[in-house]
Every structure is written in C-alpha cells, then in structure tokens.
C-alpha cells in the first residue's frame, strides 16, 4: 500500500481467482483513543472500533472511502483504490491501446519545435468518474523539471457503437536547451483513476523523436509565362524554432490529381519554392520535416491548381 | 579549428548533411526491432553528447565557435573509432553494400576538415563496449547509430548556420 495523495491510498493486488489479497491497517487521524467506529462509503454499518482498523482487501467491494467517527462526528477519511496485477502485469483497462507506432502505446506525444514544449494525448471509452494526473521530468535518476498543466477532454468521437474520449495535456521543460543533443529522455507519467480503480501509464521519449512541424504557411502559386509550369512558394510555419539557418526544414512538394489513383508527382527541396507542372483539377501540397533528423513530416498544406 | 582560424563552413556543411543522410540509411526510421526493444537498460550514455554549455547554439557560435567545433571534433573521432571497432566488424556481418563503411569514411573526412594534420585537440577515450553475444552486438550497433543520428543532426545545424552567418 502506498499514498497517492493526502488520504488516498493505492493497494496493489495480485488479481486471480481466490487470491488472498492484502492485509491493510488503517489508522484514524485523531488524538482521540476511545469510542472510535469505522464505516465504508455511505453505509452506516460499523466495520470495527478502535483507533486502527485491519481489513483484508481482495476485491473492489473492499475498496472505497473508510471513515472513522466518534459520537456522530467525522474524524478522518482514507480512500482506498485498487491497482490490479494480472499474470505479473499491471492492468491497463482505463486507456485504449492506440497501437501506433506499436502495441501497448497508451500515451502519444508530439512537439511542434525544439522549445521543450510538447503535447501528449490518450483515449478512453469511459465517460464518468474519471480523473487524470500528469507528471513529467527529464531523466529519472536525477530528474530535471518539466511542468505539465491539467489534463483536459480535447475531443469526443463516435467509433461504431462506442463513444471515444480524447484527453490531452501540455507540458513544458523548465530549462529547455533547444540546440543541445538530448542524452536523457523525457519521462511522462499519467495516473488514471476510474471509480476505485487506479492505473498508471508511462511514456519515454526524446523531443527530437516526437517533432512534427506545423504545415508550411502562405502557400502560393505563380504561373510561369507561356508554360504549364507554376512556381510554388511557401514559408516556414510560425511555430517552428528559430533561427531557420540553424533549425532548417526540408520540404516535399506533391502534385495530386482529383482521383486518388492518379500518379503523384513529388519533388523534395530544402528551398521554400519549387517549380512544378500544374495539371487541370490537380492540387499542390507541401509538407515539412526537420532537415537533419528524420522525425515526422508535417500535415500537408494544399492549394488547388486552377 | 585549432589556433582559432575559421573552418571551411560550406564544405563542413555539405559533408555533415551527407553524414545525416548516411546515418539514416545505415539505420532507417523505424524497424520492428526499435519497436520491440525500447525500454532497454543498456543505454549508450558513454558516447559524447553536444550539451547545453558547449556553445553550439546560434549565440554561442557567434561568440566563439571554437568550443563547439572542438566538441564536434571529439564526437566525430569517437564515433569513427566505434564504427571501426569489432562492434561493427564482428558478427553478425554487415552487408557488402552497407552504408556503415561510407559513414565511417565520412566521419573521418569531416574530422580532418576540422583538424588538419599537425594540429591536435584532445580526444575522448573509447570505452571497451564490445559485448560477447552477436545479438548484443547488433542491439549495440543500432543504439550507436541512433545516437550518431542525433549527434550529426546537431553538427549539421551548426555547420549550416555557420555557412549562412559566419562564412567570410
């Protein structure tokens, strides 16, 4: 058993049929010694008396808010949550496995630049009685500070018969050094509580591996005289790290016909312009990637050819 | 460059960008082994990293690029020795068309651009890393190439910025 926060405790249980459970001793936070009784949740049934209460925690029916009273007055509370371990592995019932980029990916994170700011998100099908708490650091043995905000519900989607809820959180490294080569990964830890079930999820990454630039901005076409060619030009996204002579991007320019089956013409360039042939009903798209490190491409910025 | 003269920024830029390309072709973006082997206890933290105080940021380069160039040189020599060691020459054997050979030669080439014959910066000792099992060697190769990708990315940024702003 360990303390999650004041008056909230997590009991770690091996979860299998007829498991013996854990013996837990609760102590009433009071100077009083006599006349103390214990109840669980809203029930008025007295579970025991005395300053301490010993219980055998085996299942969710044994978890909940234990309260000690004296003469009708509440003295203190202890909320017990359960953390299940099945076949030696902690349960992951609350969050959905996003399966990208691999199985058992519950948290996904992205950064728009090297400033030390990043966003993480996760999915669940649970709509009520759900709380999240997020902590982060750079490194784990001698952790350096990363400040995370509160997790918020950022999207709701209907997936077949189910509703899916996306939560996200923004974090910022306290003393970010954008130009340095990271040697210690960022660690993100999410505590999830659904009713009386506790679970924790972690992710470990370097900012450089989660970089995904915003799409190029101000995408424009300039027709070239007496030619089917056009000059496409664009600019670095505002959110990208500066100076651009140091934090350089590379670009992919694509000409795509109306039908997805049509052959795509692609050009790669380090410049912020390119000359391409504009076909009728086609569109021109440009996306960006860090020039020197193969992290994710941005989403496409697009303009129609006509 | 030893003695405080300016490096051939444009040549260094071209060669460092080539190094980036080679490092990624030697170990592509994501293979299923990356996905299966994360959370690994044996990290390669004994490789030299370009750290915050090394003056490799744009401001530090403008103030005095020598600290940063020395750090990059140390790293290039370190990785060049690693790629020539039995971590990469032992089993499992590399393919004949492996980019590791070119990568090895390019690391040496860039380090020589930074430190011409006769000038000497101190270099970092190479730890004796070589594991006994082929599978351990393979994982260590992947780790070394992964950290080399991060190192040469920073070096390439430095030379690109230098070529754009510090070239005579």
């Amino acid at each position: 058993i360990w303390e999650l926060k004041k008056d909230v405790y997590v009991v770690e249980l091996d979860w299998y049929p007829d498991a013996p459970g854990e013996m837990v001793v609760l102590t009433c936070d009071t100077p009083e010694e006599d006349g103390i009784t214990w109840t669980l949740d809203q029930s008025s049934e007295v579970l025991g008396s005395g300053k301490t209460l010993t219980i055998q925690v085996k299942e969710f029916g044994d978890a909940g808010q234990y309260t000690c009273h004296k003469g009708g007055e509440v003295l203190s509370h202890s909320l017990l949550l359960l953390h299940k371990k099945e076949d030696g592995i902690w349960s992951t019932d609350i969050l959905k496995d996003q399966k990208e980029p691999k199985n058992k990916t519950f948290l996904r994170c992205e950064a728009k630049n090297y400033s030390g700011r990043f966003t993480c998100w996760w999915l669940t099908t649970i709509s009520t009685d759900l709380t999240f708490s997020v902590k982060s650091s750079r490194g784990s043995s001698d952790p350096q500070g990363v400040t995370c905000g509160a997790a918020t519900l950022s999207a709701e989607r209907v997936r077949g018969d189910n509703k899916e809820y996306e939560y996200s959180v923004e974090c910022q490294e306290d003393s970010a050094c954008p130009a340095a080569e990271e040697s210690l990964p960022i660690e993100v830890m999410v505590d999830a509580v659904h009713k009386l079930k506790y679970e924790n999820y972690t992710s470990s990454f370097f900012i450089r591996d989660i970089i995904k630039p915003d799409p190029p901005k101000n995408l424009q076409l300039k027709p070239l005289k007496n030619s089917r060619q056009v000059e496409v030009s664009w600019e670095y996204p505002d959110t990208w790290s500066t100076p651009h002579s140091y934090f350089s991007l590379t670009f992919c320019v694509q000409v795509q016909g109306k039908s997805k089956r049509e052959k795509k013409d692609r050009v790669f360039t380090d410049k912020t312009s390119a000359t391409v042939i504009c076909r009728k009903n086609a569109s021109i798209s440009v996306r960006a990637q860090d020039r020197y490190y193969s992290s994710s491409w941005s989403e496409w910025a697009s303009v129609p050819c006509s | 460059v030893p003695g405080g003269s300016s490096p051939a920024w444009t040549q260094c830029q071209q060669l460092s960008q080539k190094l980036c390309t080679l490092a990624w072709s030697a170990h592509p973006l994501v293979g299923h082994m990356d996905l299966r082997e994360e959370g690994d206890e044996e990290t390669t933290n004994d490789v030299p990293h370009i750290q915050c105080g090394d003056g490799c940021d744009p401001q530090g380069l403008r103030d005095n690029s020598q600290f940063c160039l020395q750090r990059i040189h140390q790293g290039l020599i370190f990785y060049e020795k690693l790629l020539g060691s039995d971590i990469f020459t032992g089993e499992p054997s590399l393919l004949p068309d492996s980019p590791v050979g070119q990568l090895h030669a390019s690391l040496l080439g860039l380090s020589q651009l930074l430190q011409p014959e006769g000038h000497h910066w101190e270099t970092q000792q190479i730890p004796s890393l070589s594991p006994s099992q082929p599978w351990q060697r393979l994982l260590l190769r992947f780790k070394i190439l992964r950290s080399l990708q991060a190192f040469v990315a920073v070096a390439a940024r430095v030379f690109a910025h230098g070529a754009a702003t510090l070239s005579p």
Epitope: G88, I89, N103, K104 | A26, H27, P28, G31, H32, M33, R36, E37, E38, G39, D40, E41, P92, S93, L94, L95, S98, P99, V100, P134, W135, Q136, L138, L139, F142
Partner: antibody, heavy 119, light 111 residues
Framework: EVQLQQSGPELVKPGASVKISCKAS????????MNWVRQSHGESLEWIGD????????TYNPKFKGKVTLTVEKSSTTAYMELRSLSSEDSAVYYC????????????WGQGTSVTVSS | DIVLTQSPASLAVSLGQRATISCRAS??????????MHWYQQKPGQPPKLLIY???NLESGVPARFSGSGSGTDFTLNIHPVEEEDAATYYC?????????FGGGTKLEIK
Amino acid sequence: EVQLQQSGPELVKPGASVKISCKASGYTFTDYYMNWVRQSHGESLEWIGDFNHNNDVITYNPKFKGKVTLTVEKSSTTAYMELRSLSSEDSAVYYCARGLRGYYAMDYWGQGTSVTVSS
Amino acid sequence: DIVLTQSPASLAVSLGQRATISCRASKSVRFSDYFYMHWYQQKPGQPPKLLIYLASNLESGVPARFSGSGSGTDFTLNIHPVEEEDAATYYCQNSRELPYTFGGGTKLEIK
C-alpha cells in the same frame, strides 16, 4: 548450460483447456524473449507468439489470438501457455523456444509437449 | 504475413556431395544492414536447432560445412560436404515482420 524443460504430454477432451509450462535455467531469463511454436503432426512450424521480458509485452500471432494466453512467472523463471476451447485441430507438439533480441531467431528449444485432443 | 516457400520439398544427396535448399520470401526481409532470415535443422522426435542467423551467420557450435547466403527475397542453405548425420528436415524462418513465419520444410536424405 541453457535448458528449457517443458511439462509432460496432455490428453484432453474437446472444449477443455490445457496449460503447458516451460522452466528456463542456465541464463538470465529477462535478457531474452520466450517464444511458443506449434508443430502439427508431419507439418511445418507455426509461431504462436512471444513474451518480451524486457518490457513485459506479449505479442500474439493473430491466428492464435483468443485461443492462447501466454504468461510468465519471473520468480521461478517459468513461462506458461494456456490453450482454450480445444478441438482436434489443436492436437500438435508445442515448443517453447528462447528468442534472441535484435534478430529474433530461436537458439534454444524445449523438448516439446504433445497435446492430443480426443473424446 | 510474409510467406516463405521452400524448395525442393525433399532431396536425396550422396555422402560428401553438396545439398542446396532454397527459400523464397513473398517480400523483402531486409532491415538496415541485415536480412532477417534464419535456418533450422530438425531431426525426428527432436526440437529444431538453429544453424544460421541473419541469412549468412553461422550459429556458434554449428559445423562450418553449413552456410547461408542470399539477398532480398531469395535465400539458400548449403551443406557441403554432406554427412550421414545431416539427414533431417530444414526450415527457414522470417523475423523481419510479425507474425514470424516458417517455410514448409525440406527433407534431406543421404544416399
């Protein structure tokens, strides 16, 4: 000396379940994967799935998902494979095999456990 | 899934001669600098035994008369000179992609 010792042969009725064990010794259990492979009579080999002790991730061949559960008891360095809802098509020899990280070949194998499903 | 097709299904080779077994993958098994193809030998009543890993590397303790080669999608196991104790079924295995797959096997007889 590396050894993988599997439990003995099983004769089970259709619809029943069976749990096979594989006791590993002679090496650092958590440095390697544990694979399970099926060989039906006179047939080739089929990979069922593996357990990555390095990060506790279990990967199943989709063909066997729902049929098989892989578990591990690290304290006793024993791997288990449970087969459910057995039918005659599940009659086969089942092997555990140590998996090499990095290239995922299987360098040491258990002696095999024969499972016969018959009414 | 990557499908591995072995040929021939069986072959008989005279003592001291060369045995050549082929394995064709339905797509490339290359990642980085390696071909994720392995070879095993299985004798009746015994589990398989690893012979060659990553297409061409000899597993420790395996006699040097066994060798592996190939690239992309076509791989070969050679045994030369063949000995009496080499009578067995040989399997190739892909570990480039999940799920890992095995070839159908090649049964080698010694004449």
